[in-house]
Structures are given as structure tokens and as C-alpha cells.
């Protein structure tokens, strides 16, 4: 073992004990005394039966990830230190870890580092203070309460926004105004649109369209097409009635009701 042609002295694997909260990264450092020309560096976890389970490896400037991509090996700039990290550590990652180096031919040699212990602790909501922290169950209830209240507030705000949008859109629609995208951008549905509760009324079957086509209101061309539903304030005529079968969900107010907003 102490032969003068030994490629490098035994590996170090630091720290001897590492304690992390669950969800944080757990990083060990495997260090070589010097940098051999050709080597393989393996990262192991010791199984309950004292077997070494390989987690990841580094060979010839190439990282070989294991089955679990949370286990990562990174070579540091100094060339002789390797970070062996568990990304977002879990409670069951607690255990004994080590690294092993295989010096490739002509001077084949295998070195194993000392073992190190990882302890993953349950996450606490805030760092420990002088006063005792409340039990986890209570903090969970508080968290649920906060989420609930926030959800209600967001819902109320969205309803107010929807009411405002509808109030802004439909009076203009009754005067024959064109609904264009510039002012009414919140109505646009798309991946970057704000979440707005929409009611799907299906396809309106206007049978009169073939006989008396109406010229559309002048409108600047744009990418997205919008349909404007106009409920004129004149008596109902059979030719302008939407077929009931084509309506889904809530029914719009009948023309007899006169102009008005959709019920919320």
C-alpha cells in the first residue's frame, strides 16, 4: 500500500457527518491527493447489508449519472475535488456514503474513501428561535387557512374583474360597437392571458343569416377572432332566435328582457 509508485494517496470524503433539511441539496466532497491521468471515480451508498450501491460516476471528464438523476457528480476547477450532490434530499436518503477511485492501467489500483454519514432532517417552517415552534399539524392548518383565504380573495377579485369587463363590453355591443382586442385584452384566451372565468355558451345557430346578412361593424384587423353576441332591445322575431339545442350551460336573457348584462 505504501509503495512509492502508488498513483495517489487514499481519497478523502468530506464531511464525515453531513446534516441537511429535506429538500435542500446534500453535497459531499471527494478529493484526490493529486490528479492521475486516467481514472474512474465512483460514488456509493452503503446498503443495510453493507453492500456498496453505485449512485453515479465520473470517468475521463465525463459524468455517468446513475438511475436516479438526483445524484450528481461535478468536478471542481482545481481538478482534484469532486462534488457529489443529492439534489433535493429526501428523508430516506439518510445513510452512509463513500467514494471510490479506480486508477486505470498500466498501474491499476482501487482506492476507497472513509465513510461519511448523511442525516436528512424534517424541514422546519422557520429557523429555530428562542420560543418553541408550534407542532407541525398546527402549522399545516395555518397554511391551509392562509391558502383558503388567499383563494377566496383571488376569486372575489376575478369576479369583480369579470363584472367590470362585461360591463365595459356589452353596453358598447348593444350600440353596434365592435369588440376589438386592444382595450379588451383580458378577454383574450391564450397561454399568457390572465386566468378569467369564462362561460361557454356553445355555438349560436342563427338561421336568419342566409336571408339577411348584416354588414359587419368596421374593425381593425387582428390575429384573434372574436364573436360579439348582440341582444337587441326590440321584440323577438322568430328569424333571430337562437336554437335552444345549440346552447350549452346557462341561457342568455331573452330579447324580451331588453338589453342587459349576462347574469353572474
Amino acid at each position: 500500500l505504501d509503495s512509492p509508485d502508488r498513483p495517489w494517496s487514499p481519497l478523502t470524503f468530506s464531511p464525515a457527518q453531513l446534516t441537511v433539511q429535506e429538500g435542500e441539496n446534500a453535497t459531499f466532497t471527494c478529493s484526490l491527493a493529486d490528479i492521475p491521468d486516467s481514472f474512474v471515480l465512483n460514488w456509493y451508498r452503503l446498503s443495510p447489508r453493507n453492500q456498496t450501491d453505485k449512485l453515479a460516476a465520473f470517468q475521463e471528464d465525463r459524468i455517468e449519472p446513475g438511475r436516479d438523476r438526483r445524484f450528481r457528480v461535478t468536478r471542481l476547477p482545481n481538478g482534484r475535488d469532486f462534488h457529489m450532490s443529492i439534489v433535493a434530499a429526501r428523508l430516506n436518503d439518510s445513510g452512509i456514503y463513500l467514494c471510490g477511485a479506480i486508477y486505470l492501467p498500466p498501474n491499476t489500483q482501487i482506492n476507497e474513501s472513509p465513510r461519511a454519514e448523511l442525516s436528512v432532517t424534517e424541514r422546519t417552517l422557520e429557523p429555530p428561535t428562542q420560543s418553541p415552534s408550534p407542532p407541525p399539524r398546527l402549522s399545516g392548518q395555518l397554511q391551509g387557512l392562509v391558502i383558503g383565504v388567499t383563494s377566496v380573495l383571488v376569486g372575489v377579485l376575478l369576479l369583480l374583474l369579470l363584472t367590470w369587463v362585461l360591463a365595459a363590453v356589452f353596453p358598447r355591443a348593444t350600440r353596434g360597437a365592435c369588440v376589438c382586442g386592444s382595450e379588451d385584452e383580458p378577454l383574450k384566451e391564450g397561454p399568457d392571458a390572465a386566468p378569467v372565468f369564462t362561460l361557454d355558451y356553445g355555438e349560436l345557430d342563427f338561421q336568419w343569416r342566409e336571408k339577411t346578412p348584416e354588414p359587419p361593424a368596421p374593425c381593425a384587423p387582428e390575429q384573434t377572432e372574436y364573436a360579439t353576441i348582440v341582444f337587441p332591445g326590440r321584440p323577438a322575431s322568430p328569424g333571430r332566435r337562437a336554437s335552444a339545442s345549440s346552447l350549452q350551460g346557462a341561457q342568455p336573457p331573452s330579447p324580451e328582457d331588453g338589453p342587459g348584462l349576462w347574469p353572474l
Epitope: 478523502t12 468530506s14 464531511p15 453531513l18 446534516t19 441537511v20 433539511q21 435542500e24 446534500a26 453535497t27 466532497t29 478529493s31 475535488d81 462534488h83 424541514r123 429557523p127
Partner: nanobody
Framework: QVQLQQSGGGLVQAGGSLRVSCAAS????????MGWFRQAPGKEREFVAA????????YYADSAKGRFTISRDNAKNTVYLQMNSLKPEDTAVYYC????????????????WGQGTQVTVKP
Amino acid sequence: QVQLQQSGGGLVQAGGSLRVSCAASGRTFSSYGMGWFRQAPGKEREFVAAISWSGGTQYYADSAKGRFTISRDNAKNTVYLQMNSLKPEDTAVYYCADYTDYVVYRPQEIGYWGQGTQVTVKP
């Protein structure tokens, strides 16, 4: 310029306890964290323990395992090393270290040091 001001230490009987502390100033707390090294007479400076600034991660050398506890108080920008069950071989000058990126275990890779605190454990 980072400045690390150490306090604590002293003389204690074997089996006793001591606490050393290190207050950091002149820095923003974007660095990784802080740690402790020690240097016994005639020996090289060696890693003892370290802690991340979140406090969620602690690192211990084999010599400190189970006996020493590192902690921090971010409000005071201070790191503590609580040493229990002290042995005569723990006698050394203890140095506070500042980590700017990640934990390292070689003293030559540390950027800033405290002035050192003598800890002497009598048999």
C-alpha cells in the same frame, strides 16, 4: 473587507464544555456560510465544522462528530461552535472561516480567517 471577530474559548477540564463564537462584519450575506478550523501545536490546520447561511446544512469532521454542534444567529451575523465532552486532543487554536462559494476542507482555499481563539483541555 470581511472581518471575523472571535470570542469565547479558554481553559476547561476534560469532559467539560466550551462555546466559541464568530461575528462577521463588512460583508453581505450572499456567501455560502461559515465554519471552524483548528490548529494544534506542531500540526496542520484542519477542518472542524461548517454551516450554510440558511442553517439547514451542517458539516462536521470526524473529530467533531457527535460532540460539537455548529449553529448560527443571522440577526447577529454570528456563528457558534458548541463543544461538549472535550478531550485533551481538542486542545488547539480554533479559527473561524468564511465561505464565499461552497464548503471547502483545505485551509489554503479559505479567503478570510478570524484571529483565532485558544481552547485548552486539561486531562
